[in-house]
Amino acid sequence: SWMWNQFFLLEEYTGSDYQYVGKLHSDQDRGDGSLKYILSGDGAGDLFIINENTGDIQATKRLDREEKPVYILRAQAINRRTGRPVEPESEFIIKIHDINDNEPIFTKEVYTATVPEMSDVGTFVVQVTATDADDPTYGNSAKVVYSILQGQPYFSVESETGIIKTALLNMDRENREQYQVVIQAKDMGGQMGGLSGTTTVNITLTDVNDNPPRFPQSTYQFKTPESSPPGTPIGRIKASDADVGENAEIEYSITDGEGLDMFDVITDQETQEGIITVKKLLDFEKKKVYTLKVEASNPYVEPRFLYLGPFKDSATVRIVVEDVDEPPVFSKLAYILQIREDAQINTTIGSVTAQDPDAARNPVKYSVDRHTDMDRIFNIDSGNGSIFTSKLLDRETLLWHNITVIATEINNPKQSSRVPLYIKVLDVNDNAPEFAEFYETFVCEKAKADQLIQTLHAVDKDDPYSGHQFSFSLAPEAASGSNFTIQDNKDNTAGILTRKNGYNRHEMSTYLLPVVISDNDYPVQSSTGTVTVRVCACDHHGNMQSCHAEALIHPTGLSTGA
């Protein structure tokens, strides 16, 4: 059998001779040189050489355990004379013994970490790790202990884990944001003679909302012209907050003051300013100065810092309304006037009134905007605003006249304003009724008496208040001995009736009936219209067959009778 134990070899040997490893030995070896020892495997013949007679193994080079901790070799023992193996070919190992020749090395040269400001003592920040290439299973060469070289009293490090924690209460970012901590890792359990390495940890305190917004001044004053329309920005105020980001966001609001309804404040998200804007129309003549109480507050508040006081601040904003030379103001937004259509020229219709709203109360003059009254039908007294006609009117031509009146300050013609006038022309009975259409009808030769041959309709351009009431009659000159009669239906229509049985077209082929149409208004208006009646041959159904004159084309819907 082989007679050996495990071979051990100290790393980093610095002697001048080869380093002795150990001896391969067979119990068959009688010491007479009859056996030959053969070495093969890891580093055989190069790193490790064997005396083939004695079995002594030596290392020819300085070995580094951290490069290779174990070498696996094979041993043979052969009878020199016969060449027969006297021992089985066997593996054995040479284990390289560790010395403390490696310092701990941190996984990063520089660590960066963050921790919220005002954190409790003992809050985890970051864990640093150092590794030691030496043998962790043997001695303390790789037993690493962490300590803090720089960064006290703010931070501490757990000696075994490398966990860095906060060590000081109320670390305030607004006071100091950056810390550079130097951590040492030392092997040999931190004992004297141990090797060490260091790393830098750059720690940044992140912001928490521990500061309220603060106005830099207690009072602000702004001016704005009374003419500023709603939405006009009139000034900016800015509260400052020592925090950053979301924690420094500010919302502005108006909490009190006579200007509460007249002004708004909006927050500019980019600049974090409060913009005071006009909410309602201002009037210098009514109120010249407004006072507002504006509040700046953090929308996101951390409850644990509420003990520091309210996270808001107030300031007074004084707004001075500046006078603006305003145009005259009419007493009404629009005027509606009426006038009879038979009014004479220079008839006064009504009047308009405008006043300068300014304290100066400048006098005004009136004029008609001629673009709205091209025909110069109306005029205005420039001094008192009276409107009068300058031409005759006709309701039937134009019912409404829409004109614009201008009021201009005499001392400052640039200041003017306009108002619409709606003038309604009232009806006068100045038009006679007349036939709605031209009537031409026929009567059958064999017609019977009192037969309806045509219904008459009338129209009137006038528009009486109580509606039209027309009356129809034959003209006096045709009333006696007429072959036809007019029957007034009392509904603004009338019928033409036959007055005899039978007509002879050879005797009389055409009748002309003069019909008088009158209205019932004041003064009464009437007109005479003529209805042409032709005598025609008809079939037994009453349908026209032939007339002496050209064929009749009579309007649809007319009842001709049978």
Epitope: S1, I72, G83, P88, S90, E91
Partner: antibody
Framework: EVKLVESGGGLVKPGGSLKVSCAAS????????MAWVRQAPGKGPEWVAF????????YYADTVTGRFTISRENAKNTLYLEMSSLRSEDTAMYYC???????????WGAGTTVTVSS | DIQMTQSPASLSASVGETVTITCRAS??????LAWYQQKQGKSPQLLVF???LLADGVPSRFSGSGSGTQYSLKINSLQSEDVARYYC?????????FGAGTKLELK
């Protein structure tokens, strides 16, 4: 007396597993490499696997790589062959053999029979 | 892989005769060759290793020779107990391979 005794053979279904053992006595077990050699009925021997004395070197035949695992317990003077995903062609007498120098077999056990059949 | 070709597959000889079995490797195996004897129902036994060296307890009528790719096993003065199958095996590199065997019978 140098002796190798195999055990654990038997009948197993295709796809099944089996672990056979070899108990060594009469020599310094930890000085020797060991091997498994099998012999199908009517055929010549076929090398299966080798393990060096300290188990740093292990080799397998291509036909069993990935399915068979050779191992040893020097403290117990025992060699093992764990077989999985067995096939009908794995049916054979399995011998445990001692290796003397670079893979020749100077001592053989009597063998254990492994039959793979459904 | 190295193939081992053994011949003859079988042979008959009389007691006292000399018998030679040959084995050819598909490539140079540098004398890393062993011969085994396997009797009916038994496990193989080592006869020769390193091509020429007899294993302990093997009768001297057995001898091995050869080099490179050609090897042979010679049995002088054949005995009745020599009836068996004979296998060659190379151990030059893995995978280790055996020859198909030679069956030796008595006439």
């Amino acid at each position: 007396e140098v002796k190798l005794v195999e055990s654990g053979g038997g009948l197993v279904k295709p796809g099944g597993s089996l672990k056979v053992s070899c108990a060594a006595s009469g020599f310094t077990f930890s000085d020797h490499g060991m091997a498994w050699v099998r012999q199908a009925p009517g055929k010549g021997p076929e090398w299966v696997a080798f393990i060096s004395n300290l188990a740093y070197s292990i080799y397998y035949a291509d036909t069993v790589t990935g399915r068979f695992t050779i191992s040893r317990e020097n403290a117990k003077n025992t060699l093992y062959l764990e077989m999985s995903s067995l096939r009908s062609e794995d049916t054979a007498m399995y011998y445990c053999a001692r290796v003397y120098v670079k893979w020749y077999f100077d001592v053989w056990g009597a063998g254990t029979t492994v039959t793979v059949s459904s | 892989d190295i193939q081992m070709t053994q011949s003859p597959a079988s042979l008959s000889a009389s007691v006292g005769e000399t018998v030679t079995i040959t084995c050819r490797a598909s490539e140079n195996i540098d004398s890393y060759l062993a011969w085994y004897q396997q009797k009916q129902g038994k496990s193989p036994q080592l006869l020769v290793f390193a091509a020429t060296l007899l294993a302990d307890g093997v009768p001297s009528r057995f001898s091995g020779s050869g080099s490179g790719t050609q090897y042979s096993l010679k049995i002088n003065s054949l005995q009745s107990e020599d009836v068996a199958r004979y296998y060659c095996q190379h151990y030059y590199s893995t995978p280790l391979t055996f020859g198909a065997g030679t069956k030796l019978e008595l006439k």
